[in-house]
Amino acid sequence: EKWEETELDQLFSGPLPGRLPVNHRPFSAPHSSRDQLPPPQTGRSHPAHTAAPQVTSTASKLLPPVAFNHTIGHIVLSEHKNVKFNCSINIPNTYQETAGISWWKDGKELLGAHHSITQFYPDEEGVSIIALFSIASVQRSDNGSYFCKMKVNNREIVSDPIYVEVQGLPYFIKQPESVNVTRNTAFNLTCQAVGPPEPVNIFWVQNSSRVNEKPERSPSVLTVPGLTETAVFSCEAHNDKGLTVSKGVHINIKVIPSPPTEVHILNSTAHSILVSWVPGFDGYSPLQNCSIQVKEADRLSNGSVMVFNTSASPHLYEIQQLQALANYSIAVSCRNEIGWSAVSPWILASTTEGAPSVAPLNITVFLNESNNILDIRWTKPPIKRQDGELVGYRISHVWESAGTYKELSEEVSQNGSWAQIPVQIHNATCTVRIAAITKGGIGPFSEPVNIIIPEHSKVDYAPSSTPAPGNTDS
């Protein structure tokens, strides 16, 4: 039995089921009350809230069968309408143990915030129960099979299902999605909508114009053979209730990226420059890697360009193995699957002055016995411009004797090329090495020069800038 929307109001206007006298007022209880039934107005041997005597198995077989009365089987209505339906049952007095009626939908009990009322109509023969269920402003989620359950004498009784069918405009369960595609390359878009009512037919729309003259049954897959420029696609879903239009999705054509929009010099050392950049628009395709181009700014434009490749992220690269105290021009470009961006504008960066690359030369060490000092002399190393301005020297002197080891160093200013160091230990070997210092740092140490310091009388020294043998005794 199927009820259409126009007949819904009749659901509760007919006569109540069973043998209900007109003068009987019903008891009402909300659905959530799962207590035993209220006592009938006519006398019973036991109140309903007390346990009835056990009916013998023979007697229970003799009890008349109890079942829910037939009711409407199928309700069809539009979204946002109100709906009411009911279950009813007549329980003879011979049944002493009865639980309340519960509502179920699609196999799950409906608890809590559902609007349901149970009404009881007692008389001399027993009680008639009507369970009313109402839904205000139905939605698609209310679609389903509703039924009642109750326990009578420990036996579960289930009503026939009432199928509620909420009809409305097509509802999208899969809409087309934005994609980025290669120029002139085929791709697919999918659209799926459902009723009820079914069937749902699909029309595809590209840039406000229909693509297919004849509708396709949902779900529909549109194969686009390829695009040369950005397009907007949507789909229309039609059923007997009307039309729903999906969101419009942009299909972008992948292009080469834009060049970086910022390039910054974060730090410079004598031989490296740390550069960061902000990528430009990615061309609808993820950036794969970036290229840092470096050329010496002071050279003519035909100077060679060094290229350093790095991953697209992080947007940071340390350019290494550069000359000290040099000016460089730097530019960055990045690539995606389509190709390389244009190169960013060239920016300027400089390395700082380096440390000296050579040690002081012609180192000589003499022992001045009368003053108990070492007299050390050297010649200034040939320092290149990029090594920076000479600020001084570091002298390392190591003293070794049978039971002692002492390592010391002194710094002297760049004025002059000699120094005097007090003798630290007698009867020992002193090893002297010297390095030049600029603002860029300390250069390499010279080869060691050894001198033997006697107890207090004879002296043996090796005034040399070449390595002295470990033992100077001849």
Epitope: H264, V278, P279
Partner: antibody
Framework: QSVEESGGRLVTPGTPLTLTCTVS????????MSWVRQAPGKGLEWLGI?????DPVYATWARGRFTISRTSTTVNLKITSPTTEDTATYFC????????????????WGQGTLVTVSS | AQVLTQTASSVSAAVGGTVTISCQSS????????LSWYQQKPGQPPKLLIY???KLASGVPSRFSGSGSGTQFTLTISDVQCDEAATYYC????????????FGGGTEVVVT
């Protein structure tokens, strides 16, 4: 792609005013933005730049008088204590490229918003 | 301080003629070529014409051209049209000091 300024109005001297710049068609997470102003009948004056990756840089004359800031969706210019000399049309401009606060070129201009400072 | 000087505040040209506007920078602009030119018509925002001294911005007619390097720059408009009556500004990026960008004072082009 477009840039639009808002917030310009008549203010009394000393009353702070914040101008807002909103963009469409490109992302503020990609581009530096600058503010430029033009007094009635006068030339263009550069106020400063807010970069994606580094702190704002201001013209010497503008430092302390203006504050440039950015969010993910807007660029703001606060005139901290306006004087009558700050009466001008204020332009928000996209910077096509920059390095360490130095703009390379200003490639997309808004229509400007008029600020009038008068007692 | 960084200064861009446009010596002529106004120049006139006949339709179809050629107009030249000069811009002098002190000190040299960044990388010798970070100089751009802008056109501003009455009641409108400026529009980028030339960048990096000589590169044409997108959508700008090739009748506009720029030249120069370091401190001396020129904007040339050949075959001048009526609707190119406007004020033209040079602008430069600078690395020295704190003023990293500045505009010239502008040159008005009157088309007769």
């Amino acid at each position: 792609q477009s840039v639009e300024e808002s917030g310009g109005r008549l203010v009394t001297p000393g009353t702070p005013l914040t101008l807002t710049c909103t963009v469409s068609g490109f992302s503020l997470s990609t581009y530096s933005m600058s503010w430029v102003r033009q007094a009635p009948g006068k030339g263009l004056e550069w106020l400063g730049i807010v970069s994606v990756a580094i702190d704002p840089v201001y013209a010497t004359w503008a430092r302390g008088r203006f504050t440039i800031s950015r969010t993910s969706t807007t660029v703001n210019l606060k005139i901290t204590s306006p004087t009558t000399e700050d009466t001008a049309t204020y332009f928000c401009v996209r910077v096509a490229f920059s390095t360490n606060g130095i703009p390379h070129r200003l490639d997309l201009w808004g229509q400007g918003t008029l600020v009038t400072v008068s007692s | 301080a960084q200064v861009l000087t446009q010596t002529a505040s106004s120049v006139s040209a006949a339709v179809g003629g050629t107009v030249t506007i000069s811009c002098q920078s002190s000190p040299s602009v960044y990388n010798h070529n970070w100089l751009s030119w802008y056109q501003q018509k009455p009641g409108q925002p400026p529009k980028l014409l030339i960048y990096e001294a000589s590169k044409l911005a997108s959508g700008v007619p090739s009748r506009f051209s720029g030249s120069g390097s370091g401190t001396q720059f020129t904007l040339t408009i050949s075959d001048v049209q009526c609707d190119e009556a406007a004020t033209y500004y040079c602008a430069g990026g600078f690395s020295s000091g704190s003023d990293s960008f500045a505009f010239g004072g502008g040159t008005e082009v009157v088309v007769t």
